[in-house]
Interface confidence: low
């Protein structure tokens, strides 16, 4: 028969023959022949291959370096890589999470819109009219101005995005 020019799924072409690819978690030891099937071997400890492949070496699991603020989120298997995340209070510098940076605080006049996670930084938002934040914080939202009316008081000093309103007693002479 004519030698094949293309192979089926999960096969590869070598020496005019279609050989089976090794399954995920295994590496190639030797190609198939006319008489023998592809020889594969399981990946060793701390190694993986996540696709049907003809690789002669497995990939090393990612190392979550604690010196870079990383810790293991999900341990790797022979078919999956280790997933790293950042220590509490830090977040990844990239999607691959190769190192971490400190969560940042929102300055006075800004509140936390979204608290930081292991993969995303703190998201700050300016305090809108009627709200304020007087601290630099990585977790505090903008607080609403005090309602003087509900306390039977009047506004003596207007609030800003950084300060609360100041309430005071009503001037009874002008009531």
């Amino acid at each position: 028969p004519e030698p094949p020019t293309a192979c089926r799924e999960k096969q590869y072409l070598i020496n005019s023959q279609c050989c089976s690819l090794c399954q995920p978690g295994q590496k190639l030891v030797s190609d198939c022949t006319e008489f023998t099937e592809t020889e594969c071997l399981p990946c060793g400890e701390s190694e993986f291959l996540d696709t049907w492949n003809r690789e002669t070496h497995c990939h090393q699991h990612k190392y979550c370096d604690p010196n870079l603020g990383l810790r293991v989120q999900q341990k790797g298997t022979s078919e999956t890589d280790t997933i790293c995340t950042c220590e509490e209070g830090w977040h990844c510098t990239s999607e691959a999470c190769e190192s971490c940076v400190l969560h940042r605080s929102c300055s006075p006049g800004f509140g936390v819109k979204q608290i930081a996670t292991g993969v995303s930084d703190t998201i700050c938002e300016p305090c809108p009219v009627g709200f304020f934040s007087n601290v630099s914080s990585a977790f505090e939202k903008c607080h609403p101005w005090t309602s003087c009316e509900t306390k039977d008081l009047v506004v003596q000093q207007a609030g800003t995005n950084k300060t609360d309103v100041v309430c005071g007693p009503q001037d009874r002479l002008r009531a």
Partner: antibody, heavy 120, light 112 residues
Framework: QVQLVESGGGVVQPGRSLRLSCAAS????????MHWVRQAPGKGLEWVAV????????YYANSVKGRFTISRDNSKNTLYLQINSLRAEDTAVYYC?????????????WGQGILVTVSS | DIVMTQSPLSLPVTPGEPASISCRSS???????????LDWYLQKPGQSPQLLIY???NRASGVPDRFSGSGSGTDFTLKISRVEAEDVGVYYC?????????FGPGTKVDIK
Amino acid sequence: QVQLVESGGGVVQPGRSLRLSCAASGFTFSSYVMHWVRQAPGKGLEWVAVMSYDGSSKYYANSVKGRFTISRDNSKNTLYLQINSLRAEDTAVYYCARDGGKAVPGPDYWGQGILVTVSS
Amino acid sequence: DIVMTQSPLSLPVTPGEPASISCRSSQSVLYSNGYNYLDWYLQKPGQSPQLLIYLGSNRASGVPDRFSGSGSGTDFTLKISRVEAEDVGVYYCMQVLQTPFTFGPGTKVDIK
């Protein structure tokens, strides 16, 4: 205004321990990341350690890892640096510094520094 | 670790003239949010360091506008448009992107 005052320095024999303190005022201490930085006589600045605002995360320079411990007491507005097994190369002025947070990343206010001399 | 280098290490200046200091990082300090996590500090003789520039190009509060920072990624420059006598001291760059945070070796600026 922001004020950081270091204390606890002095002359110490090699191999001994020392605890430096940094008293903070003029800002909400518990909301800020804090650093220690040191400077050997006639040399440049060397970053030593950092601690998150709530004390849950701490990181160190490779040169001090295992011997130095950074800690804080937010109720006392105080940052600490415990130095064990002191060596001659630890002789330096030690500064505590506040991190400016998201708006101003990195140390934005520094203390006046405290001298630690390691000598027999 | 990110290694920081500065040049020159010594810079004699003439009052009224411009001055420029270069800082280079061994890997990019440009974060995905578009900011460069690089600060500049001045340590005047006998004093603690003071923050001049943060996030690569932002002047810290109270810093005169003759100081400016520029650059991105791995190459940064601190410029003084017209040097004054009070500007003498050692200038340091520092990366604050990832731990361990690291300083450059410093540039000593003095009057000619």
